[in-house]
């Protein structure tokens, strides 16, 4: 079937997920499109431990994640509940700032140089991280 039991080439396995780290930038929607074509999604950060893992791999570089509020409320791309989930915003963020002069506010979340999150204009060409979960069935211990 289509179940994934190990990570593809050039992806990094961590805690039963696979991660791919870009080395160049795209707008949020185009990064999202890239991940989806690879049967993945922009990274969804669900714990401090996952935050530190991603932060270690991306370094001090603005990097898109799978969090946006383009349709109103903040939403994770995989449906993970935002309100009750892990958050790591910078102080005073998100602020939906309109002062950048690019039109509109700021609807897409990214890791900043210190790893904490900021909302920014979705058209900015930032690096991104894709994530895909390994097949849940493969987590079961083998039958003896």
């Amino acid at each position: 079937g289509s179940e994934r039991t190990c990570c593809p080439v050039n992806w990094v396995e961590h805690e039963r997920s696979c991660y791919w780290f870009s080395r160049s930038g795209k707008a949020w929607a185009d990064a999202d499109n890239y991940c989806r074509l690879e049967d993945a999604h922009l990274v969804v950060v669900t714990s401090w431990e996952e935050q530190k893992f991603v932060q270690h791999h991306i370094g001090p570089v603005n990097t898109w994640m799978g969090l946006h509020d383009q349709n109103g409320p903040w939403k994770w791309v995989d449906g993970t509940d935002y309100e009750t989930g892990f958050k790591n915003w910078r102080p005073e963020q998100p602020d939906d700032w309109y002062g950048h002069g690019l039109g509109g506010g700021e609807d897409c979340a990214h890791f900043t140089d210190d790893g904490r999150w900021n909302d920014d204009v979705c058209q900015r060409p930032y690096r991104w991280v894709c994530e895909t979960e390994l097949d849940k069935a493969s987590q079961e211990p083998p039958l003896l």
Epitope: S2, P8, N10, S22, R23, S24, G25, K26, A27, A29, D30, A31, N33, Y34, R36, L37, E38, D39, P125, R127, W128
Partner: antibody
Amino acid sequence: EVQLVESGGGLVKPGGSLRLSCAASGFTFSSYPMVWVRQAPGKGLEWVSSISISASYIDYADSVKGRFTISRDNAKNSLYLQMNSLRAEDTAVYYCAKLGTTVSGGHYFDLWGRGTLVTVSS
Amino acid sequence: EIVLTQSPATLSLSPGERATLSCRASQSVSSYLAWYQQKPGQAPRLLIYDASKRATGIPARFSGSGSGTDFTLTISSLEPEDFAVYYCQQDSNHPLTFGGGTKVEIK
């Protein structure tokens, strides 16, 4: 041999339907996104549709949205394009292509079939 | 949608000469640009990706350069088999798009 072979093209009247197939061999078909690209006679190349590895994500050019359906069968190493409500402007050679990825995050067509001609005319 | 404009439309050269093909994007595509070669009756073939990286099996006489909006494909010394149509393609912004092509013909 690493190759893609398209079939299913032909002459069809406006409003008609066709189903194109693409048979893959020589590589792990189930590990790559795939696309259809077309080329009208004497014209340039136009992306038509993309499909992710397990078909969980599908995308279409505006010009074919709602009329064409892309699908794949990884067990059969095959890619398909169902074309309905065909128009004269859909006349083209249709190529299937493998979508290769790069470390920078680019998607490029690193393997192409030889194409199949679709002619829409009354 | 990003528009890619290729120039010249036709390039008439002799074998052994240097060919310089241009591709200009309507907005920045960073380095997400590829070049393809297509001979009559054949499928396109990937030559260059990420603006400057040669695809597997492509001879060293083909080179790509540029970033942002201006890109160049150079064929250092034309071989008889290089006379064909060349297309650029961007994968920076959705939808991915192709240029209109440059035909390299024998002078």
